[in-house]
């Protein structure tokens, strides 16, 4: 999916206003120097699409993060913000949250996360940049 | 059942505030957006704007910029629109409708009833 | 953005096959298939017919469905009902600023 007609304002609001928080709370007890950041983004359409991948795609060490309150709260505000965020798009990440059900807080989870926040940051960094 | 309970008529003076609420029931309240749509007399729907619970995010039609404000309260599943600076022309029924699901908030899947205010000097 | 163009009314005998077109720009109906339409009675609230241009949801007849080409969008009414009488508004995404615009509305009248 091209995220390059979302409004980018209003998704870094969503961001700093709820999002952010709710993956903080994920990582609590663990330190920020806990994990290396592996992924990066360029520019804003790109740092959606990592987000988009790292939050919805599920991993082998790491299948629960779509139920997560950031997650759900992540696809709101691309929904809400990207015009041509696909029902598809939606309706797939919806039939994977189904199919999970233990909800396990690994070491991998944990790294994903921190992996989310780091693009998350980079993508409020990019924004800057444009302004 | 799902359903959508609107507070009653209101009559208004022009230039005063009103405030019509909206209660939630039968469905998971963060899971979707509210809608106000309202209706004038012998005319069409037109959109005024949206909260989305989970986000804690409102969007305004331009048209009511600045005069419209939409809240939620959480405990008790209600929605609550407040227009304000009334002139007669706002005169119409004004209803509460729910979003679709899945984070399909473009269409409108369950509507109140509806709420007449009547702004008359 | 201004509101899709409606038909005023248009009108059918009983068993017919009525079509209500729904005409907006390339920034609305013609950028997304984001169109619903909706079914009104006299003094009563809208109900959801059809979304995302061609999607039935539950309990709505099959008799009723909707299509899309360029700029436009059709609501198709076939074997038409005396409670089909009603007011019918599309309406279509229309990006995050606007967001939802509403047709003005074709008043069906069964003769």
């Known amino acids: 999916y091209d995220f390059t007609n979302c409004d980018f304002q209003k998704i870094e609001a969503d961001y700093l206003r709820t999002i952010s928080k709710d993956l903080i709370t994920y990582m609590s007890g663990t330190k920020s120097t806990d994990f290396n950041n592996t992924v990066s983004c360029s520019n804003r359409p790109h740092c959606l699409t990592e987000i988009q991948s790292l939050t919805f795609n599920p991993t082998p060490r790491c299948a629960s993060l779509a139920k997560e309150m950031f997650a759900r709260k992540t696809k709101a505000t691309l929904a809400l913000w990207c015009p041509g965020y696909s029902e598809t798009q939606i309706n797939a990440t919806q039939a994977m949250k189904k199919a999970r059900k233990s909800k396990v807080t690994t070491n991998k989870c944990l790294e994903q996360v921190s992996q989310l926040l780091g693009l998350w940051r980079r993508f409020i960094r990019t924004l800057l940049k444009k302004q | 059942q799902e359903q959508l309970v609107q507070s009653g008529d209101e009559v208004k003076k022009p230039g005063a505030s009103v405030k019509v609420s909206c209660k939630s029931s039968?469905?998971?309240?963060?899971?979707?957006?509210i809608s106000w749509v309202r209706q004038a007399p012998g005319q069409g729907l037109e959109w005024m704007g949206m909260?989305?619970?989970?986000?804690?995010?409102?969007n305004y039609a331009e048209k009511f910029q600045g005069r419209v404000t939409i809240t939620a309260d959480p405990s008790t599943t209600t929605t609550s629109m407040e227009l304000s600076s009334l002139r007669s022309e706002d005169t119409a029924v004004y209803y509460c409708?729910?979003?679709?699901?899945?984070?399909?908030?473009?269409?409108?899947?369950?509507w109140g009833p509806g709420t007449p205010i009547t702004v008359s000097s | 953005q201004s509101a899709p163009i409606q038909p005023r009314s248009v009108s059918g005998s009983p068993g017919q096959s009525v079509t209500i077109s729904c005409t907006g720009t390339?920034?609305?109906?013609?950028?997304?298939?984001?169109i619903s339409w909706y079914q009104q009675h006299p003094g009563k609230a809208p109900k959801l017919m059809i979304y995302?241009?061609?999607k039935r949801p539950s309990g709505v007849s099959d008799r009723f469905s909707g299509s899309k080409s360029g700029n436009t969008a059709s609501l198709t009414i076939s074997g038409l009902q005396a409670e089909d009488e009603a007011d019918y508004y599309c309406?279509?995404?229309?990006?995050?600023?606007?967001?939802?615009?509403f047709g003005g509305g074709t008043q069906l009248t069964i003769v």
């Open positions: 409708a729910r979003g679709g699901s899945n984070y399909l908030y473009w269409y409108f899947d369950l």
């Open positions: 039968g469905f998971t309240f963060g899971s979707y957006a």
């Open positions: 909260l989305v619970p989970l986000l804690g995010v409102t």
């Open positions: 390339s920034s609305d109906i013609g950028g997304y298939n984001r």
């Open positions: 995302d241009v061609s």
């Open positions: 309406s279509s995404y229309a990006g995050t600023d606007t967001f939802v615009l």
